[in-house]
């Protein structure tokens, strides 16, 4: 039966289910050079010490070489994401060698046994790379290992064991169980390649975290905080399914890392940007939308190498599907005063109007209490490119903190039926775009009327005194 922690419970059971598998003495790791995008094509099996398949299959010694490493499997058959990734790599890097590392016999085991097999698989990859290095023109710097889940740690072992340094390792939601908090030599770490970038999409601070929570690369990117991915909720995934299981939710969130990477390959014109931040809560407050000093980066394949950084945690929001890109905005709202607010906590809503499009009405997520006579910072994001912002519509609603406070409010209202309405006073909104790094200040359309009651709207336009407030003259930062 599921643990109290919900979705992870059933999966925890699944991880420890014994598998009745016939095993035979055969090479447990096979290297399939995918010479065609055609899924029906058998490709070429590379064999250590046998140069003929390299020649027969047109292995390009001077080109980039990708090794795709799958993870633990419940089926013993490749999962559908593999075809998408191979196809996307072929599309983006037409001359590249794309090699699928097939370690299904060792991955289709009890999870604990599969974990224990990661070292030997990593060693097999390292031996293959050492052999390839003996060939003229083959450079380890052109090698990019892409590992999903348990495969990310396999990539780490391979990078650790190889003679020399692999160019890049991308960890796609590296597995968490048995790796969280492990020594750097027993998991993926920044030492394993010249550049190690990681996408974390299924991390949980309680229950079973399928993906590793700790940063393990030079840059560690946590889309949507690295936990709940849009489009992967129970309603989204189980929707109209007759026999939906919670493992569908797990698969959706865990596998999202792969799809974000595929998106970065095929939607090159719609890159997603992540922003360095100390934690998810600060990012949700909109504090971390800076690109200064390499504080922002593209995600996935387009990530720029930042070897000076170690365990740099980066965050972004995404859409529920491809293309995943959204447009981030920091909003600073100075609440000058409350009037008759009582115990009511305001919830703000904004609608952004731009030269290209207008946004939907967006709620401003409250991470901490709204402070009066202080500047409150929020993060908002839109799925469409609005262009240059022209105006903002602001509304708010009062959300009671508790039933007791609601009763107090009601009692107060009944005893003083002519009590003047609750109001907030807001004179300006400062906006910064994460994607363009542009800063704008919006002033109340009517400077004499800056008070706003619940349900009413206040309009803000670009302030007449220019694009920026004083002391905000930093030039637009060009994104990497």
């Amino acid at each position: 039966s599921p643990t109290p922690f919900g979705p992870e419970g059933q999966l925890a059971d699944e991880l420890h289910k014994p598998k009745a598998i016939q095993t035979e003495v055969k090479p447990s790791v096979r290297f399939n050079l995918r010479t065609s995008k055609d899924p029906e094509h058998e490709g070429c099996y590379l064999s250590l010490g046998h140069s003929q398949p390299l020649e027969d299959c047109g292995f390009n010694m001077t080109a980039k070489t990708f090794f795709i490493i799958h993870g633990w499997t419940m089926s013993g058959i490749f999962e559908n994401w593999l075809h998408k990734l191979v196809s996307a790599l072929h599309t983006r890097e037409k001359d590249a060698n794309v090699v699928v590392v097939d370690w299904l016999p060792l991955a289709h085991q009890l999870y604990t046994d599969a974990v224990n097999n990661t070292r030997v698989v990593g060693h097999s990859i390292a031996r293959m790379l050492d052999w390839l290095q003996e060939k003229d023109d083959f450079s380890l710097g052109n090698v990019h290992l892409i590992g999903y889940s348990l495969g990310a740690h396999v990539a780490g072992y391979a990078g650790n064991f190889v003679k020399g340094t692999v160019g890049r390792i991308t960890g796609l939601d590296p597995a968490g169980p048995m790796f969280e908090g492990a020594d750097i030599h027993k998991r993926l770490s920044p030492d394993d390649a010249d550049f190690v970038d990681v996408l974390h999409t299924y991390t949980r601070s309680f229950g079973l975290s399928i993906g590793i929570q700790m940063p393990v690369g030079h840059i560690d990117i946590y889309p949507n905080g690295g936990d709940f991915q849009p489009g992967c909720g129970l309603n989204d995934v189980l929707g109209s399914m007759a026999y939906g299981t919670i493992t569908e939710v797990v698969k959706c969130e865990h596998e999202r890392a792969v799809h974000l990477f595929v998106d970065s390959l095929v939607n090159q014109d719609k890159p997603s940007f992540a922003f360095q931040c100390t934690d998810s809560n600060r990012f949700k407050k909109g504090i971390c939308l800076s690109c200064r000093k390499n504080r922002c980066n593209s995600i996935g394949y387009n990530a720029k190498k930042m070897r000076n950084k170690r365990n740099s945690k980066m965050y972004l929001k995404t859409r529920a599907g491809m293309p995943f890109r959204v447009y981030h905005y920091q909003m600073k709202i100075h609440v000058f005063s409350y009037k008759n607010m009582g115990e009511i906590e305001p919830t703000f809503y904004v609608t952004l109007y731009g030269t290209n499009a207008d946004s939907q009405t967006l709620p401003l997520e409250i991470v901490e209490r709204i402070e009066q006579n202080a500047t409150n910072t929020f993060l908002v994001y839109t799925e469409e490119d609005l262009g240059d912002l022209l105006k903002i519509q602001l509304t708010w609603e009062g959300a009671s903190q508790s039933w007791y406070n609601l009763w107090k409010e009601l009692r107060s209202y009944l005893s003083q039926p002519h009590n003047p309405g609750r109001e907030l006073n807001i004179r300006r909104i400062r906006v910064k775009s994460g994607e363009t790094q542009r800063k704008l200040t919006f002033c109340a359309e009517d400077p004499e009327n800056t008070s706003i009651s619940p349900g009413r709207e206040l309009w803000f336009r670009k302030c007449r005194d220019g694009w920026r407030m004083k002391n905000e003259t930093s030039p637009t930062v060009e994104l990497p």
Epitope: E24, S28, I77, F78, N80, L82, H83, L104, P105, L238
Partner: antibody, heavy 119, light 107 residues
Framework: QVQLVQSGAEVKKPGASVKVSCKAS????????MHWVRQAPGQRLEWMGG????????TYNEKFKDRVTITRDTSASTAYMELSSLRSEDTAVYYC????????????WGQGTTVTVSS | EIVMTQSLATLSVSPGERATLSCRAS??????LHWYQQKPGQAPRLLIY???QSISGIPARFSGSGSGTEFTLTISSLQSEDFAVYYC?????????FGQGTKLEIK
């Protein structure tokens, strides 16, 4: 060319078992997964399970999990599907189908084996 | 499991005309969708895989499109041999499932 040849029609009594074979030729048997799909009269196709012939790893449809066993003999390039505790609703045409490299689609099918369950 | 729905049980089209068959998945399956043709007494035949990829040996009049939950098989100019039952199949997650089929008949 790729060929999948299945064993002949079977008539079985309820509660009995049936074992259908599928001999592959024209490709490397261990390089592609083999799947079993059935079709009851006038019904949609139904995936029963698959095997990775390279090492024998299997995956089954939960609906059949307790009754179906898929095996293979690599030396004979043959896959087998055994269905036990037969009931009348198991009357169907059973197909073996070769998966693509990723195991998702089936470009080659056996000719089908009719299994009739009747008392 | 993912439920595949082919809304039309039967589609009547005249030879030489275009036929458009639809298939809907109960959840996002990206491009993991395959189309098969089946004639009476025969095994299914793969026409299109991974939503839009053509198969060698299959006439160019067959094409596929769609992604996510909505998919379409188009036969640009129907030939007499195209009248059959068409099935869609998803391979996004286990168990793999098929639609109930659309019978394409002569109008």
């Amino acid at each position: 060319q790729v060929q999948l040849v299945q064993s002949g029609a079977e008539v079985k009594k309820p509660g009995a078992s049936v074992k259908v074979s599928c001999k592959a030729s024209g490709y490397t048997f261990t390089d592609y997964t083999m799947h079993w799909v059935r079709q009851a009269p006038g019904q949609r196709l139904e995936w029963m399970g698959g095997i990775n012939p390279y090492y024998g790893g299997t995956t089954y449809n939960e609906k059949f999990k307790d009754r179906v066993t898929i095996t293979r003999d690599t030396s004979a390039s043959t896959a087998y599907m055994e269905l036990s505790s037969l009931r009348s609703e198991d009357t169907a045409v059973y197909y073996c189908a070769k998966g693509d490299y990723y195991g998702g689609s089936y470009n080659y099918w056996g000719q089908g084996t009719t299994v009739t369950v009747s008392s | 499991e993912i439920v595949m729905t082919q809304s039309l049980a039967t589609l009547s089209v005249s030879p030489g005309e275009r036929a458009t068959l639809s298939c809907r998945a109960s959840q996002d399956i990206s491009n993991s969708l395959h189309w098969y043709q089946q004639k009476p007494g025969q095994a299914p035949r793969l026409l299109i895989y991974y939503a839009s990829q053509s198969i060698s040996g299959i006439p160019a009049r067959f094409s596929g499109s769609g992604s996510g939950t909505e998919f379409t098989l188009t036969i640009s100019s129907l030939q007499s041999e195209d009248f059959a039952v068409y099935y869609c199949q998803q391979s996004n997650s286990w168990p793999y499932t098929f639609g109930q089929g659309t019978k394409l008949e002569i109008k």
